[in-house]
């Protein structure tokens, strides 16, 4: 029985050229997190595996940084980074939990007035 819930940073905006932290948090379960995937709909960005550590998709290595924690930091943002990001928590014994974040990358002057969310 999957009792857990995923909390995410929800819809976030950031400015072009800046950076953003994508973060999810699994709560209400004692299940052990064995792997977390960060993905877009058509490709994987990063994997944090309990045994193997972090793997970053090669094309993103120079502007994606692991962490903080199980989160992911995107740097040198471009308008093309706008879109959906998924965190997939592989857990034992519960199974898989998925969270969704929508990132909008804006021109600097617009982004300054946009809402930003971050899970403490």
């Amino acid at each position: 029985m999957m009792t857990g819930t995923i909390e995410t940073t929800g819809n976030i905006s950031a400015e072009k050229g800046g950076s953003i932290i994508l973060q999810c948090h699994l709560s209400s379960t004692t299940a052990q997190v064995t792997q977390v995937n960060w993905e877009q709909q058509d490709q994987l960005l990063a994997i944090c595996n309990a045994d193997l550590g972090w793997h970053i998709y090669p094309a993103f290595k120079d502007r994606v940084a692991p962490g903080p924690g199980l989160g992911l930091t995107l740097q040198s943002l471009t308008v093309n980074d706008t879109g959906e990001y998924f965190c997939i928590y592989h857990t034992y014994p519960d199974g898989t939990y998925t969270g969704r974040i929508f990132l909008e990358v804006l021109e600097s002057s617009v982004a300054e007035h946009g809402a930003r969310f971050q899970i403490p």
Partner: antibody
Framework: QVQLQESGPGLVKPSETLSLTCAVS?????????WNWIRQPPGKGLEWIGY???????SYNPSLRSRVTISRDTSKNQFFLKLSSVTAADTAVYYC???????????WGQGTLVTVSS | DIQMTQSPSSLSASVGDRVTITCKAS??????VAWYQQKPGKAPKLLIY???YRYTGVPSRFSGSGSGTDFTFTISSLQPEDIATYYC?????????FGQGTKVEIK
């Protein structure tokens, strides 16, 4: 329970356009996931054709991109495959499938055989 | 495109035997590999995702392992109902690609 069901002509003439429908029941195609087409020539392996996501964005296999269009009718909870300029090499069982990020293709239709022949 | 090469292409084993299939990716795909079972005339069924995680309802005799470019799928004790063709698939990036399949038969 999610169910996917392919339908369409079983025979298509060379150079014509293959058109298939995938009817989804038990889940709204606008709620989540990527809705895919995958094919399997007789006695051969599986080839991913492309998808339309719940938000309407599409992604195609580069090997077929110039001939493929995937679209949807949200009111009927259906999505469609069109493959133009078909040849005998396009003869295959065509499957629709639901993909979940991080997992793979967890739900499949039963498949429909399309033969390209004059 | 990422090529997935499976071996062997077919095998014959006795009921109760341990069966192992390997899959090699043409580049590092971390743990983004799934395994499917396809019986004749039927659609494939997802068995394993992310290299080693059993999908809901899949019997414990099916397991997967590996990371990077080398992956293994194992049936710990072959049952008559396991006669099928098994495919690996990378879910690392599009175009998503499959191995050519391994046909498992009973001796």
């Amino acid at each position: 329970q999610v169910q996917l069901q392919e339908s369409g002509p079983g025979l298509v003439k060379p150079s014509e356009t293959l058109s298939l429908t995938c009817a989804v029941s038990g889940y709204s195609i606008t709620s989540d996931y990527a809705w895919n087409w995958i094919r399997q020539p007789p006695g051969k392996g599986l080839e991913w054709i492309g998808y339309i996501s719940y938000s309407g964005s599409t992604s195609y296999n580069p090997s077929l991109r110039s001939r493929v269009t995937i679209s949807r009718d949200t009111s009927k909870n259906q999505f469609f495959l069109k493959l133009s300029s078909v040849t005998a090499a396009d003869t295959a069982v065509y499957y629709c499938a639901r993909r979940q990020v991080g997992l793979g293709f967890a739900y499949w239709g039963q498949g429909t055989l399309v033969t390209v022949s004059s | 495109d990422i090529q997935m090469t499976q071996s062997p292409s077919s095998l014959s084993a006795s009921v109760g035997d341990r069966v192992t299939i390997t899959c090699k990716a043409s580049q590092d795909v971390s743990t983004a590999v799934a395994w499917y079972q396809q019986k004749p005339g039927k659609a494939p069924k997802l068995l394993i995702y992310s290299a080693s995680y059993r999908y809901t309802g899949v019997p414990s005799r099916f397991s997967g392992s590996g990371s990077g470019t080398d992956f293994t799928f194992t049936i710990s004790s072959l049952q008559p109902e396991d006669i099928a063709t098994y495919y690996c698939q990378q879910h690392y990036s599009t175009p998503w690609t499959f191995g050519q399949g391994t046909k498992v038969e009973i001796k």
